[in-house]
């Protein structure tokens, strides 16, 4: 058993049918010695008397808020949560497996630049009685500081019969060094509590691997005289690291007809302009990627040819 | 060339070669199914590689103040990786395919290190750790780890040379 926060304790339960459970001793936080009784949640049933209460925690029915009283007065509370292990595996019931980029991906994180700021998000089908707390550090044995805000509900989606809720959190490395080569990964730890169930989720990554630039901005077309060709120009997104001579992007320019089946013409360039043939009803899209490290491409920025 | 006394390297040549190194490092080890090599344990194998750290002066301001600290660090790393790519980790079983980019990568690391340091001037180099994995699968895993680490290293080096070519070239 360990303390999650003041008066909230997590009991680690290795569960299997007929498991003996975990013996837990609760102590009433009071100088009083006599006349103390214990109850669980809203029930008035007395579970025991004395300054300590010994319970055998076998299932969620044994978890909840234990209260010690004396003569009708509440002395202290202890909330017991369960962290359940089955077949040697800690439960992961609260969050959905996003399966991208691989199975058992519960947390996904992205950064728009090398400033040490990143966003993580996760999905759940649970709508109530749910709390999250997020901690992060650079490295684990001698951790360096990363400050995370509060997790907030960022989107709701309907998936078939189900509603899906997306939560996200923003974190910032305290002493980020954008130009350095990372040698220790960022660790992100999310504590999730639903009703009386505690679970924890972790992710470990280098900022360089989660970079996804914003789409290029100010995408413009300039027709070339007496030609079907156009000059496409764009700019680095505002959120990208500076100076651009150091933090350089590469770009992919795509001409796409109305029909998805039409052949796409693609050009790759390090410049912020390109000359392409603009077909009727086609659109021109540009996306960006770090020039020197193959992390994610940005989303497309698009303009119609006409 | 970065010669004793600290004159400037051939920034543009270094830029071109370092960008080529980036391309080669990724073609040698593309992100196959997002294999997370940090989960594979045996951290000490790639913990000893030289990293371009915060105090190494490889940021834009540090390069403007005195690029020599950074260039020395990059040179150390190039020599270190060049030795690794020439060691039995890469020459032993399982054999690399004949058209593997590792050979070109090895040659380009050497080429860039020579651009940075002419004959007769020696910066101290980092000792290469004695890594001799006994099993072919261990060797394969080590290759992946080294290449992933090299990708990060050459990305920073390429940024340095691109910025130098744009802002520090005579």
């Amino acid at each position: 058993i360990w303390e999650l926060k003041k008066d909230v304790y997590v009991v680690e339960l290795d569960w299997y049918p007929d498991a003996p459970g975990e013996m837990v001793v609760l102590t009433c936080d009071t100088p009083e010695e006599d006349g103390i009784t214990w109850t669980l949640d809203q029930s008035s049933e007395v579970l025991g008397s004395g300054k300590t209460l010994t319970i055998q925690v076998k299932e969620f029915g044994d978890a909840g808020q234990y209260t010690c009283h004396k003569g009708g007065e509440v002395l202290s509370h202890s909330l017991l949560l369960l962290h359940k292990k089955e077949d040697g595996i800690w439960s992961t019931d609260i969050l959905k497996d996003q399966k991208e980029p691989k199975n058992k991906t519960f947390l996904r994180c992205e950064a728009k630049n090398y400033s040490g700021r990143f966003t993580c998000w996760w999905l759940t089908t649970i709508s109530t009685d749910l709390t999250f707390s997020v901690k992060s550090s650079r490295g684990s044995s001698d951790p360096q500081g990363v400050t995370c805000g509060a997790a907030t509900l960022s989107a709701e989606r309907v998936r078939g019969d189900n509603k899906e809720y997306e939560y996200s959190v923003e974190c910032q490395e305290d002493s980020a060094c954008p130009a350095a080569e990372e040698s220790l990964p960022i660790e992100v730890m999310v504590d999730a509590v639903h009703k009386l169930k505690y679970e924890n989720y972790t992710s470990s990554f280098f900022i360089r691997d989660i970079i996804k630039p914003d789409p290029p901005k100010n995408l413009q077309l300039k027709p070339l005289k007496n030609s079907r060709q156009v000059e496409v120009s764009w700019e680095y997104p505002d959120t990208w690291s500076t100076p651009h001579s150091y933090f350089s992007l590469t770009f992919c320019v795509q001409v796409q007809g109305k029909s998805k089946r039409e052949k796409k013409d693609r050009v790759f360039t390090d410049k912020t302009s390109a000359t392409v043939i603009c077909r009727k009803n086609a659109s021109i899209s540009v996306r960006a990627q770090d020039r020197y490290y193959s992390s994610s491409w940005s989303e497309w920025a698009s303009v119609p040819c006409s | 060339r970065a010669v004793p006394g600290g004159s400037s390297p051939a920034w543009t040549q270094c830029q071109q070669l370092s960008q080529k190194l980036c391309t080669l490092a990724w073609s040698a080890h593309p992100l196959v199914g997002h294999m997370d090599l940090r989960e594979e344990g045996d951290e000490e194998t790639t913990n000893d590689v030289p990293h371009i750290q915060c105090g190494d002066g490889c940021d834009p301001q540090g390069l403007r103040d005195n690029s020599q600290f950074c260039l020395q660090r990059i040179h150390q790393g190039l020599i270190f990786y060049e030795k690794l790519l020439g060691s039995d980790i890469f020459t032993g079983e399982p054999s690399l395919l004949p058209d593997s980019p590792v050979g070109q990568l090895h040659a380009s690391l050497l080429g860039l290190s020579q651009l940075l340091q002419p004959e007769g001037h020696h910066w101290e180099t980092q000792q290469i750790p004695s890594l001799s994995p006994s099993q072919p699968w261990q060797r394969l895993l080590l290759r992946f780890k080294i290449l992933r680490s090299l990708q990060a290293f050459v990305a920073v080096a390429a940024r340095v040379f691109a910025h130098g070519a744009a802002t520090l070239s005579p």
Partner: nanobody, 123 residues
């Protein structure tokens, strides 16, 4: 959000068997841990059995262990209670419940309830 409808109750002789079904509709069935409870007139609701969302783990009250089997079919959105060697003291209204906590024998840990199906065991 989840509607539960029990069926399969009836009158049987002691020692006989019965299979109860509980059909779920609404939200995704496989998100929920499922349970069976029973309530005889004038008594508290009593836990019978529960099953986790994947159907890989089950949990039983001591009074039914070895006689009752809970199972589920996530493709049919249905949970079952196979009752054998029935006794007169098994007579009750059997209620199906859906919740988020497994294992739990406590009724307030379940969020959704069916109306129940009557099982009467005569001697």
């Amino acid at each position: 959000e989840v509607q539960l409808v029990e069926s399969g109750g009836g009158v049987v002789q002691a020692g006989e068997s019965l299979r109860l079904s509980c059909a779920a509709s609404g939200r995704s069935f496989s998100d929920y841990e499922m349970g069976w409870f029973r309530q005889a007139p004038g008594t508290e609701r009593e836990f019978v059995a529960s099953i986790n969302r994947r159907g890989s783990s089950t949990f039983y009250a001591d009074s039914v262990k070895g006689r009752f089997t809970i199972s589920r079919d996530n493709t049919k959105n249905t949970v079952y209670l196979q009752m054998s060697s029935l006794k007169p003291e098994d007579t009750a209204v059997y209620l199906c419940a859906a919740g988020w906590l497994f294992p739990s024998s406590r009724s307030r840990d379940y969020d959704y309830w069916g109306q129940g199906t009557q099982v009467t065991v005569s001697s």
